[in-house]
Interface confidence: medium
């Protein structure tokens, strides 16, 4: 994933639409002008904003890495949304990058659940049928997440 | 290249007063909010305040704004940090910092090297 | 003021395993949309560096091993595999409102 440029000492292009700031905020895919008196658009496929805001610049696209697809692409009001390609998925716990998923299930066990790009294949003994993760055998893991925590633009 | 480059500490008495400049070069100084964040030795950071391009906007940290004067002089591409009343606990490295664009205030994207200033009789 | 507490004040992480270091704001540090939470490594002798900004956007430069996530209060920088130039002082500061202020930082150790 590329990173955010922080100088690029960018002007608004003539041709780049301007309104004006509802109390000081401009609206989803804009951002303000320097002297606070309008709202710029954002550049579509260059750089987005998803939410009311009062930044100088927008926010510049994500590029999907290596090993990523690019599901949607960047608007002005939304950024690029990238996902692990065939045969590889993205643990939530390290996000940042493809894991491959595993070819088949340990002997005495079968497989439940294909290879998503959110989750490896899941396995499960034939007898018991509880779960192999391939870390703890025979443990069922559980996965949780925080409520207040926003989805990765790249999950 | 961004850069800053602070002068003026030193070695204060209690109840002294000093002068801190950062000279700033690489961007267009006039367009840009710049701040003072200061860092006792072996502690964390600590945001002094900060001036907006045309000095008519100056906001402090409310425990500092009456012993501490931020100014600027763009002519000069210079920040100032008038500091008074100082006390052994102002003694501190004294960063230059210019935020970065978004928000009001943002994040700090630039530093320079500090200066540091040491009260002590 | 909006106090941000960081946990732990400091921790060893082997080399390639994954340091994970939290974020606590008094209160919410989102607004419209938008978590104004960053984080900052500082070694010794050097001034902070910006890793990332508003929560999870990571500066220009900055490898893809760290990673932010959080909004409202709670925030997190993930580093991960964690390599020898890690080693350093993590800051978390907010800039929902003024005075922007910073959490305790974390040293983080390399084993």
């Known amino acids: 994933i590329t990173r955010q440029s922080l100088d690029p000492q960018r002007r608004a292009a003539p041709q780049q639409k301007r309104s004006s700031p509802t109390e000081g905020l401009c609206p989803p895919g804009h951002h303000i002008s320097e002297d606070s008196r309008e709202c710029i658009s954002c550049k579509y496929g260059q750089d987005y904003s998803t939410h009311w805001n009062d930044f100088l610049f927008c926010l510049r696209c994500t590029k999907c890495d290596s090993g990523e697809v690019e599901v949607n692409s960047c608007t002005t009001t939304r950024n690029t949304v990238c996902q692990c390609e065939e045969g590889t998925f993205r643990e939530e716990d390290s996000p940042e990058i493809c894991r491959k998923c595993r070819t088949g299930c340990p002997r005495g066990m079968v497989k439940v659940k294909d290879c998503t790009p959110w989750s490896d294949i899941e396995c499960v003994h034939k007898e018991s049928g509880t779960k192999h993760t391939g870390e703890v055998p025979a443990v069922e893991k559980t996965v949780t997440t925080s409520p207040g925590t926003p989805a990765s633009p790249c999950s | 290249e961004v850069k800053f480059l602070e002068s003026g500490g030193g070695l204060v008495q209690p109840g002294g007063s000093l002068k801190l400049s950062c000279v700033a070069s690489g961007f267009d100084f006039s367009r840009y909010w710049m701040s003072w964040v200061r860092q006792a030795p072996g502690k964390g950071l600590e945001w002094i305040g900060e001036?907006?391009?045309?000095?008519?906007?100056?906001n402090y940290t409310p425990s500092l704004k009456d012993k501490f004067i931020i100014s600027r002089d763009n002519a000069k591409n210079t920040l100032y940090l008038q500091m008074t009343k100082v006390r052994s606990e102002d003694t501190a490295l004294y960063y230059c910092?210019?935020?970065?664009?978004?928000?009001?205030?943002?994040?700090?994207?630039?530093w320079g090297q500090g200066t540091l200033v040491t009260v002590s009789a | 003021d909006i106090v941000l507490t960081q946990s732990p004040a400091s921790l060893a992480v082997s080399l390639g395993q994954r340091a994970t270091i939290s974020c606590r704001a008094s209160?919410?540090?989102?607004?419209?949309?938008?978590?104004?939470m960053h984080w900052y490594q500082q070694k010794p002798g050097q001034p902070p560096k910006v890793l990332i900004f508003l929560s999870s956007n990571l500066d220009s430069g900055v490898p893809a091993r760290f990673s932010g996530s959080g909004s409202g209060t709670d925030f997190t920088l993930n580093i991960h595999p964690v390599e020898d130039g890690d080693a350093a002082t993590y800051y978390c500061?907010?800039?929902?409102?003024?005075?922007?202020?910073f959490g305790g930082g974390t040293k983080l150790e390399i084993k």
């Open positions: 001036i907006n391009p045309d000095s008519n906007t100056i």
């Open positions: 500061q907010h800039s929902r409102d003024l005075p922007p202020t």
């Open positions: 910092t210019r935020r970065a664009y978004y928000g009001n205030p943002a994040w700090f994207a630039y």
């Open positions: 209160k919410s540090v989102s607004s419209s949309g938008y978590s104004y």
